[in-house]
C-alpha cells in the first residue's frame, strides 16, 4: 500500500515560518503578505516506527523536491540536515531511521523528536533568520513548539 502523506507548512511558536536557505538548509523568520509564498511546503509521510500514545512516526520531505529532513552525527553531535534521495524510491513506508521523527502533539504543542536520537528535537532560535537545527532537551530559550497548517494538494 502507498504511504499516506499530507502537505503542510510549519511555523514555530513565535510564528516564524520556515524557508530554504541555500540548497540544503532551512531557516526560520517572520514572513508577511506575499513573502509567505517563500515558506517551504512539507510532504509529511506517516511511516513505520514505534508508535505510542503521544508519538506518531513521520518523515518530513519537501514537497515536489527529492529532499528529506534527516538526523545524522556530525563531529559526534546529532545534526539536522536536508538529504537528497532517489525520488523513485521515496517516500516509502519503511523509511531509514535517520529520516523518522516522532510527531508529538500535547496541549496544542507540536514537537518533532528525532527517532534516531531520542531527546533531540527540531528547533529554531529566538533570533530571526537563523538555521533550523536539532536541539537537545535542555535547549534553554530554543523553540521546539510548532503549529501545522494544512495545504491542499
Amino acid at each position: 500500500a502507498p504511504v499516506r502523506s499530507l502537505n503542510c507548512t510549519l511555523r514555530d511558536s513565535q510564528q516564524k515560518s520556515l524557508v530554504m536557505s541555500g540548497p540544503y538548509e532551512l531557516k526560520a523568520l517572520h514572513l508577511q503578505g506575499q513573502d509567505m509564498e517563500q515558506q517551504v511546503v512539507f510532504s509529511m509521510s506517516f511511516v513505520q516506527g514505534e508508535e505510542s500514545n503521544d508519538k506518531i512516526p513521520v518523515a518530513l520531505g519537501l514537497k515536489e523536491k527529492n529532499l528529506y529532513l534527516s538526523c545524522v552525527l556530525k563531529d559526534d553531535k546529532p545534526t539536522l540536515q536536508l538529504e537528497s534521495v532517489d525520488p523513485k524510491n521515496y517516500p516509502k513506508k519503511k523509511m531509514e531511521k535517520r529520516f523518522v521523527f516522532n510527531k508529538i502533539e500535547i496541549n496544542n504543542k507540536l514537537e518533532f523528536e528525532s527517532a534516531q536520537f531520542p531527546n533531540w528535537y527540531i528547533s529554531t532560535s529566538q533570533a530571526e533568520n537563523m538555521p533550523v537545527f536539532l536541539g537537545g532537551t535542555k535547549g534553554g530559550q530554543d523553540i521546539t513548539d510548532f503549529t501545522m497548517q494544512f495545504v491542499s494538494s
Epitope: S52, N53, D54, I106, N107, K109, E111, E113, P118, N119, Y121, G136, T137, K138, G139, T144, D145
Partner: antibody, heavy 120, light 108 residues
Framework: QVQLQESGPGLVKPSETLSLTCTVS????????WSWIRQPAGKGLEWIGR???????NYRPSLKSRITMSVDTSKNQFSLKLSSVTAADTAVYYC???????????????WGRGTLVTVS | SYELTQPPSVSVSPGQTARITCSGD??????AYWYQQKSGQAPVLVIY???KRPSGIPERFSGSSSGTMATLTISGAQVEDEADYYC???????????FGGGTKLTVL
Amino acid sequence: QVQLQESGPGLVKPSETLSLTCTVSGGSISSDYWSWIRQPAGKGLEWIGRFYNSGRTNYRPSLKSRITMSVDTSKNQFSLKLSSVTAADTAVYYCARDMYSGRGNWYFDLWGRGTLVTVS
Amino acid sequence: SYELTQPPSVSVSPGQTARITCSGDALPKKYAYWYQQKSGQAPVLVIYEDSKRPSGIPERFSGSSSGTMATLTISGAQVEDEADYYCYSTDSSDNHRVFGGGTKLTVL
C-alpha cells in the same frame, strides 16, 4: 482556580478492586492530562499512571496489568481502579494534574489532598 | 528502571543554607523538579525545570542542575521549611515518572 478532590472507600479487602474518583472543580477535565500518585505510610511518592480524555494512557510497568483509568466528562471526574489488591497497596492516593513543559518533560502542578486507602 | 537518588536526611540550623542533592542518569537530558511535602499534607511544587520558581514560592528556594546531579538550595532555611523534599523527573524513554526517595530536612 482549579481544585482536585479524591473520594472512595477507605477500606478494601485483599484480592478485591480499589476504586477511587477524583473530582475536578473550577476547570474542565477535557483539556488536561491527569495522574494518580500514591504514598505508603512513611514512604516516598510513587507514580501510578496517567491518562488523557482521548484515551491516551501511560501506566507504571509494575502495576499495568491491574490498572484501569477512565473519565466521566459530564461529572468532571476521573477514576482509578486497581484490581487484586494486597496489603502492599495500602497508601494515601493522590490525584494530580499532569503538565507538559515540552521536550518530553512532565510534572504535576496541582494535587488533591489525598485519601487513605487501607487494604485489610 | 530509571532511579533518582537522594540523601535520606539533611539537618541545618535556622538561617543556614540547606542543600539537597538528587542524582540520576537522565538528568543531563531531562529537567529536575522539586516538591516539598509537610507532614500530613499533599506535595507542593517548589522548583520546576531545574531552576525556575513557581509564583508564591519564597526566593530562598533555588535549584540548579549539572550533569547527572540536580540540587535544591534553601538559603537561610527557616523552621517552617522543615519537610520532606522529593526530586522528580520523567524517564527519558517512555514518559514514565520517577520520584527520588525523598530527603527529610530538619531545621533546628
